[in-house]
């Protein structure tokens, strides 16, 4: 018979032969042959593999470094990685939660809608037309553009969400 060019799900092609993949939690020790099945071994302590695989090494569980404010939210198994979270009152810097911050800042162009608490991080909102923020801040709201008219001045440069308007003197008509 012709050697296969593709294999079924949970199999892989090697040496013109379809071998079974190792199940999650196990790593590949040796490929199958015409006479033997794929040989797999369970991952060791503090290791995991989360897919059907042909990996020869298991992945190390993530380390939740207390020096970065991290602690274990969910202990890893042979099939799952450890999930880290931040100490109470601190917030993850990313979905992967690789480090912690007291709170995040809102970038220029955004203002603080709600200051961070122990349970929720800073909530930012874009500065609407007529308002701006030119700083990165964890407490400052968007500021209204300066009203040139109330100072008897005219707008020389329009404001943006990151910059205030620039006011200047009105052109005087010469007599």
């Amino acid at each position: 018979p012709e050697p296969p060019t593709a294999c079924r799900e949970k199999q892989y092609l090697i040496n013109s032969q379809c071998c079974s993949l190792c199940q999650p939690g196990q790593k590949l020790v040796s490929d199958c042959t015409e006479f033997t099945e794929t040989e797999c071994l369970p991952c060791g302590e503090s290791e995991f593999l989360d897919t059907w695989n042909r990996e020869t090494h298991c992945h190390q569980h993530k380390y939740c470094d207390p020096n970065l404010g991290l602690r274990v939210q969910q202990k890893g198994t042979s099939e799952t990685d450890t999930i880290c979270t931040c100490e109470e009152g601190w917030h993850c810097t990313s979905e992967a939660c690789e480090s912690c911050v007291l709170h995040r800042s809102c970038s220029p162009g955004f203002g603080v809608k709600q200051i961070a608490t122990g349970v929720s991080d800073t909530i930012c909102e874009p500065c609407p037309v007529g308002f701006f923020s030119n700083v990165s801040s964890a407490f400052e709201k968007c500021h209204p553009w300066t009203s040139c008219e109330t100072k008897d001045l005219v707008v020389q440069q329009a404001g943006t969400n990151k910059t205030d308007v620039v006011c200047g003197p009105q052109d005087r008509l010469r007599a």
Partner: nanobody, 116 residues
Amino acid sequence: EVQLLESGGGLVQPGGSLRLSCAASGSTIAGYEMWWVRQAPGKGLERVSAISGSGGSTYYADSVKGRFTISRDDSKNTLYLQMNSLRAEDTAVYYCARDPYSFDYWGQGTPVTVSS
């Protein structure tokens, strides 16, 4: 990397005053937003006060408004918190924090106890 060292805490009677300092080394605080945060025994972190990088804007938690004043002296690389009319509920460890507020910038804090 910035190191923050808080000082000035201690035991004070209700109605008394204290001035906390936060001295930075290894990096400047100039131009950076700064915060005072506290943690009372058995409680979570409470954000007390903040000051903008320019010093022109400040924030105070409702619980300290009118009693605490935040200030900065960038030439001394130091942040301050003047605490007046102290109450028992102000008892906590006080920490300062600098943008970007990462855990590894966190100081040891200075304990404040308000008791008669």
